[in-house]
């Protein structure tokens, strides 16, 4: 019967006794940077070409015996997971292997850098179809390795990496921390984070998504017909590399940004038990398990968005945090979050010709996060409209006044430390959905976009009594672009988007009196693109 991991990534409509997805990734080449491999294993023979690239350190220890099957173990298994003819994800994909890990699974930053350069040169000499590079390795944070990944990604290569097996923040490791790389954590058959001895999968904001990574059956280098179970974020990354190969084979023109958004969109949502993660990492870690799209074509009509969290600002009074979208993405909204609730809001600002989301810490605060909502919106023209503090009793307001521009997000930023502590909430006047409303002492920022066929609407959900969390979701066919809290609720910790749901978090209700101040309203801006929908119908 079908191995659990292949069943897990397969949409129900393809499920059968055997894993036979419609497109096997035949137009895509996957580069594997790992140990040596047993290329004559019948699972991968003819599918994997061993390049002459080898850059590995000497094995440690005088008593180390170099045994071929042990040297090949990790790479052979991963090659099988990606493209094995029996237990592989992308059965049609061809692979090339580069040896950057020695027989003990150790490598160097320099070896990996030279390997990436080898791939870049190969691509220049003989351009082929879409390329996926699988980096099933993790070391300490390396600015130079991250920069090399960035260069290759900007040359059109999709890089997929393991989050690391240190039960730690993936942002502390490379290449996992490189924003341009698709970073993958590991889950088990119960959709729980993988535990590996006393450690386990890495987590945090640098992880893009999770994938099966425990008890994964794959080719064993022990013998030509041998199979073995292995576990770890390397195996998880191999699944995503396989899924990426299949998506790219179906749609070879996909950009890295489009691919990442699709991987996120088609993932299983909210199935991971977040209690496994440290409390401070739960909100930052994506609750997503990778899956193949239900159809490899026809996803183009959707407006895809993802949430990008910044690094923590740190606790100093004037500390800020910045969240950035990928080059091909549009920043459609910006929000902020602080566990202490002490923050001075957020604003969208231009940096290097691109909008970024900046959050501001407040005096006595433990620090803030900026949260960017990054979307794929072709032919978009977005701008930020700002209204300075109004000092008027009705609060500050700003709207999208340009013809054809719609509101995609609202942000507010203030200079005073105790904004609104004793003020009742300001309610948005009805019938004015294209408007952001805020405290009179706050400057309000409206993200206004024009794009063919783009339409947006505001959805609110208010709870009169104090509640730790208030949510509002966009309905089917609409995508959440903006998430904010209605002003006046001083105990709000912040707002952020989780998939298609806007979450507004408040302080522990036990510390808040049940006054009008306890009212919490979550405001979602939901958008869709009729232009994209029509375009995909024409293609079909």
């Amino acid at each position: 019967s079908i191995p659990w991991n292949l069943e897990r990534i397969t949409p129900p409509r393809y499920r059968a006794d055997e894993y036979q997805p419609p497109d096997g990734g035949s137009l895509v080449e996957v580069y594997l940077l790992d140990t040596s491999i047993q290329s004559d294993h019948r699972e991968i023979e003819g599918r994997v070409m061993v390049t002459d690239f080898e850059n590995v350190p000497e094995e440690d220890g005088t008593r180390f015996h170099r045994q071929a099957s042990k040297c090949d173990s990790h790479g052979t298994h991963l090659a099988g997971v990606v493209s094995g003819r029996d237990a592989g994800v992308a059965k049609g994909a061809s692979m090339r292997s580069l040896r950057v890990l020695n027989c003990q699974g150790k490598g160097t930053v320099s070896g990996t850098l030279i390997g990436l350069e080898f791939i870049r040169k190969s691509q220049l000499v003989q351009p082929v179809g879409p390329l996926v590079v699988l980096l099933p390795l993790a070391g300490g944070y390396s600015r130079v390795l991250n920069a090399a990944c960035q260069r290759l990604a900007r040359a059109g290569v999709v890089l997929v990496t393991a989050a690391g097996n240190f039960r730690d923040d993936a942002c502390l490791y490379s290449p996992a921390s490189a924003p341009e790389v698709i970073t993958v954590g590991a889950t088990n058959a119960q959709d729980q984070p993988v535990t590996l001895g006393t450690l386990g999968t890495n987590f945090g904001r640098c992880v893009d998504l999770f994938a099966p990574g425990e008890d994964i059956i794959g080719a064993s280098s022990d013998c030509s017909t041998c199979f073995v179970s292995q576990s770890g974020t390397s195996q998880a990354a191999a699944h995503v590399a396989g899924i990426a190969a299949m998506m790219l084979s179906a749609e070879p023109e996909l950009t890295l940004a489009e691919l990442r958004q699709r991987l996120i969109h088609f993932s299983a949502k909210d199935v991971i038990n977040e209690a496994w993660f440290p409390e401070d990492q739960r909100v930052l870690t994506p609750n997503l398990v990778a899956a193949l799209p239900p159809s490899t074509h026809g996803a183009g009509w959707q407006l895809f968005c993802r949430t990008v969290w910044s690094a923590h600002s740190g606790p100093t009074r004037m500390a800020t945090a910045v969240a950035r979208c990928a080059p091909d993405e549009e920043l459609l909204s910006c929000s902020s979050f602080s566990r202490s609730g002490k923050r001075r809001g957020e604003r969208m600002e231009a940096q290097g010709g691109k909008l970024v989301c900046r959050a501001h810490n407040a005096f006595g605060g433990e620090g803030v996060y900026a949260i960017a909502r990054c979307c794929l919106l072709p032919q978009a023209n977005c701008s930020v409209h700002t209204a300075p503090p109004a000092e008027a009793s009705m609060g500050t307001r700003v709207h999208c006044h340009q013809q054809g521009h719609v509101l995609t997000g609202c942000s507010s930023h203030w200079e005073v430390e105790d904004l609104g502590t004793h003020k009742p909430p300001v309610l948005r006047p009805r019938g004015q959905p294209n408007q952001c409303v805020g405290h009179r002492e706050a400057s309000i920022h409206a993200s206004c976009c024009h794009a063919p066929g783009l339409e947006c609407k505001v959805k609110e959900h208010g709870i009169p009594a104090p509640q730790e969390q208030v949510t509002v979701a966009c309905e089917e066919g609409w995508t959440l672009t903006g998430c904010s809290a209605l002003p006046g609720t001083s105990h709000v910790l912040g707002a952020y988007a989780v998939d298609n749901t806007c979450v507004v978090r408040s302080r522990d209700v036990s510390t808040t009196g049940s006054t009008s101040e306890g009212a919490v309203t979550a405001v979602a801006i939901c958008c869709r693109s009729r232009h994209l929908a029509q375009a995909s119908q024409e293609l079909q």
Epitope: E18, S73, D222, C223, F227, V228, S229
Partner: antibody, heavy 119, light 113 residues
Framework: QVQLVQSGAEVKKPGESLKISCKGS????????ITWVRQMPGKGLEWMGL????????RYSPRFQGQVTISADKSISTAYLQWSSLKASDTAMYYC????????????WGQGTLVTVSS | DIVMTQSPDSLAVSLGERATINCRSS????????????LAWYQQKPGQPPKLLIY???TRESGVPDRFSGSGSGTDFTLTISSLQAEDVAVYYC?????????FGQGTKVEIK
């Protein structure tokens, strides 16, 4: 039920070509390997090679490499063993069998095809 | 190539008696990654194709009578018929299926004494 049905006995002259078949039914043909085994009169079993119909990957025993060709047509769930120029020493019973990646032994066998090469 | 050697070449046993066939491989077919012996036993009766009896050295195929058992590990293996029946008259082959080319033993002919 799961079965492999082989084509009938063949009598050929040396130098002639031949293609014998093995049709699978009752299972997912593309997800199993098909192995060919030779048994010369009064002798033991010799593994010739295999094919994976899913992608037509083949593997031959060095002894049979270049002597025979293994192929498959997954649209009709059939594997083939062929010779371009038969020799008298090719006289034997030929069996096809299936095996799976998780069970790499031959669990189901065809009934065999007797090939006689004689002038 | 892994060479499989069976002994004896032929064996005559009385009905109801135990028959023991040995098989030795030129290199180990036990693999540490899954702790399995990649060895199978087949029975071939006159005019019939081979039939799988035992796989992973000791696991009986469904439908095979429990008088057939396999044992051994690494390089030395044994097929035992605990109480020989008339229908057990056949040639028995061991096979390693771990390395290409896959190889069979030369066969052991079991007859009734």
């Amino acid at each position: 039920q799961v079965q492999l049905v082989q084509s009938g006995a063949e009598v050929k002259k040396p130098g002639e070509s031949l293609k014998i078949s093995c049709k699978g039914s009752g299972y997912s043909f593309t997800n199993y390997y098909i192995t060919w085994v030779r048994q010369m009169p009064g002798k033991g079993l010799e593994w010739m090679g295999l094919i994976y119909p899913g992608d037509s990957y083949t593997r031959y025993s060095p002894r049979f490499q270049g002597q025979v060709t293994i192929s498959a047509d997954k649209s009709i769930s059939t594997a083939y063993l062929q010779w371009s120029s038969l020799k008298a020493s090719d006289t034997a019973m030929y069996y096809c069998a299936r095996d799976h990646w998780s069970r790499p032994y031959s669990d189901v066998w065809g009934q065999g095809t007797l090939v006689t090469v004689s002038s | 190539d892994i060479v499989m050697t069976q002994s004896p070449d032929s064996l005559a046993v009385s009905l109801g008696e135990r028959a023991t066939i040995n098989c030795r491989s030129s290199q180990s077919v036990l693999y540490s990654s899954n702790n399995k012996n990649y060895l199978a036993w087949y029975q071939q009766k006159p005019g019939q194709p081979p039939k799988l009896l035992i796989y992973w050295a000791s696991t009986r195929e469904s439908g095979v009578p429990d008088r057939f058992s396999g044992s051994g590990s690494g390089t030395d293996f044994t097929l035992t018929i605990s109480s020989l029946q008339a229908e057990d008259v056949a040639v028995y082959y061991c096979q390693q299926y771990s390395s290409f080319p896959i190889t069979f033993g030369q066969g052991t002919k079991v007859e009734i004494k």
